[in-house]
């Protein structure tokens, strides 16, 4: 059945800390993506910047987490708003970030 | 016609099991995620399982969980369904689909509408006694 928004938040949260924990090797061979403004909407953003990525296992279920938070279908080169086009950090570094601010989302209750 | 072949259907008896496989003529199948889905008389298609490009991320609709398992040989260019204790309510036509993405989409969640552009042509389970 359908999975409740503070779950999948949480898995997805547990999911980001799994890959930081994990690496070893630099994540995604240091690819690098475009930052993005971590507000409403940063969900099909960070989908939009991370399906970029070619070749790298360890963000799949990333990926499919972050889809089901996104309502419309993200296709590579695709770009909203909020992404901070002439900022690109690698990989890693996004996730990092955007473990941090879903943390801080979780701890306030914000699961949508 | 299809872009995906799906073979291995069959009758079965209830508790029996039967391996789905799905191949990829026109392109390179191991570069993607594939899903299966299945139709049956009257219902509306309902998604089943999905694997990704690597093989590293694996889920199942709650009614096969346990029971099915979904996995890939990239060097052949096939993913399969092993289905076990199939049981009356298993049979339908079993597609497996992609959209040329290297991850799966999450089947609950605002995701679950995004859909999927290649399908094969399916390929019928039935489970009687």
């Known amino acids: 059945g359908p999975v409740p928004p503070s779950t999948a938040l949480r898995e997805l949260i547990e999911e980001l800390v799994n890959i930081t924990q994990n690496q070893k090797a630099p994540l995604c061979n240091g690819s690098m993506v475009w930052s993005i403004n971590l507000t409403a909407g940063m969900y099909c953003a960070a989908l939009e910047s991370l399906i970029n990525v070619s070749g790298c296992s360890a963000i799949e279920k990333t990926q499919r987490m972050l889809s089901g938070f996104c309502p419309h279908k993200v296709s590579a080169g695709q770009f909203s708003s909020l992404h901070v086009r002439d900022t690109k950090i690698e990989v890693a570094q996004f996730v990092k970030d955007l473990l941090l601010h879903l943390k801080k989302l979780f701890r306030e209750g914000r699961f949508n | 016609v299809g872009q995906l072949v799906e073979s291995g259907g069959g009758s079965v008896q209830p508790g029996g099991s039967l391996r789905l496989s799905c191949a990829a003529p026109r392109f390179t199948l191991g570069s993607y995620a594939i899903a299966w889905f299945r139709q049956s008389p009257g219902k509306e298609r309902e998604w089943v399982s999905c694997?990704?490009?690597?093989?590293?991320?694996?889920i199942y609709s709650d009614s096969v969980k346990g029971r099915f398992t979904i996995s890939r040989d990239n060097t052949k260019n096939m993913v399969y369904l092993q289905m076990n204790s199939l049981n009356p309510e298993d049979t339908a036509v079993y597609y497996c689909?992609?959209?040329?993405?290297?991850?799966?989409?999450?089947?609950?969640?605002?995701?679950?509408?995004?859909?999927?552009?290649?399908w094969g042509q399916g390929t019928q389970v039935t489970v009687s006694s």
């Open positions: 694997i990704s490009r690597s093989g590293g991320d694996t």
């Open positions: 689909a992609t959209d040329k993405r290297s991850f799966c989409y999450a089947p609950n969640g605002l995701g679950k509408g995004w859909t999927y552009d290649y």
